[in-house]
């Protein structure tokens, strides 16, 4: 498995609720990376021990973080896998999505889509304390 | 296996109009919405906009007046109409679908596409 986290991980609200997440592939010896893995959530579900599990396959180091609520600070942490297994999860990066000064997003139709707003809970092969560390 | 396919990139001169296309396979296409991003050389990604299964569409609005997006979900197609194309739109652009087996969800991005607008 990748020794190392995946590193310069940044994230980008890019439209009212989807943000941009990068990151380049883990330090150390040349690793083929097959799969990402995303964990994200509001700060308060992250608490709870509550967030989406999003995997990104491929090689492309960017990821869209969708239907996310304005108010609300979102915390984001990767992991990287190959065909031996999963790697350590890189420090968490928060990410504000500040409220609208307009209603304008009450307006908009629900997105019929993937991003329909479920969460997860569960350790995720991380002890809690690991899960809601802020780094 | 998830695949997303964009074609109809090249080279285009400054005031001209592009279609690209973005054929999904290995999933029910027609489920869920679909994003077209881009990245110019050098640059940071940018979010052109997104369309509904149901064929509705959102923008970013720096781009809104310059692109349409469309899909044929009989063919498993997403379509990217850009018109008045400047030497600042070129980029490599890529379609997007997130999709979830209702525990976990799963991003595929195309391999992209490279659009050059000169003259």
């Known amino acids: 498995a990748p020794a190392g986290p995946p590193v310069g991980v940044k994230v980008t609200l890019i439209e009212d609720d989807t943000a941009l997440v990068s990151w380049k592939p883990p330090d150390g010896p040349e690793t083929v990376v097959t799969r990402y893995t995303i964990l994200y959530a509001s700060r308060k579900a992250w608490i709870a021990g509550e967030w989406q599990v999003l995997h990104r396959e491929g090689a492309i180091t960017m990821a869209l973080l969708e239907n996310l609520v304005a108010g609300n600070v979102y915390i984001v942490k990767i992991s990287a896998s190959n065909e031996v297994g999963e790697g350590p999860f890189s420090n968490s990066v928060e990410l504000a999505v500040l409220p609208k000064e307009t209603s304008e997003s009450n307006q908009r139709p629900k997105r019929l889509d993937s991003a329909d707003a479920k969460v997860y809970s569960g350790y995720y092969h991380l002890d809690q304390k690991s899960m809601t560390g802020i780094a | 296996e998830v695949q997303l396919v964009e074609s109809g990139g090249g080279l285009v001169q400054p005031g001209g109009s592009l279609r690209l296309s973005c054929k999904g396979s290995?999933?029910?296409?027609?489920?869920?919405?679909m994003h077209w991003v881009r990245q110019a050389p050098g640059k940071a990604l940018e979010w052109i906009g997104y369309?509904?299964?149901?064929?509705?569409?959102k923008y970013n609005p720096s781009l809104k007046s310059l692109v349409t997006i469309s899909r044929d979900n009989s063919k498993n197609t997403l379509y990217l109409q850009m018109n008045s194309l400047r030497a600042e739109d070129t980029a490599t652009y890529y379609c997007?679908?997130?999709?979830?087996?209702?525990?976990?969800?799963?991003?595929?991005w195309g391999q992209g596409t490279l659009v050059t607008v000169s003259s």
């Open positions: 369309i509904y299964n149901t064929g509705s569409t």
């Open positions: 290995g999933f029910n296409f027609g489920d869920y919405a």
């Open positions: 997007v679908s997130t999709v979830t087996n209702g525990v976990e969800y799963f991003q595929h």
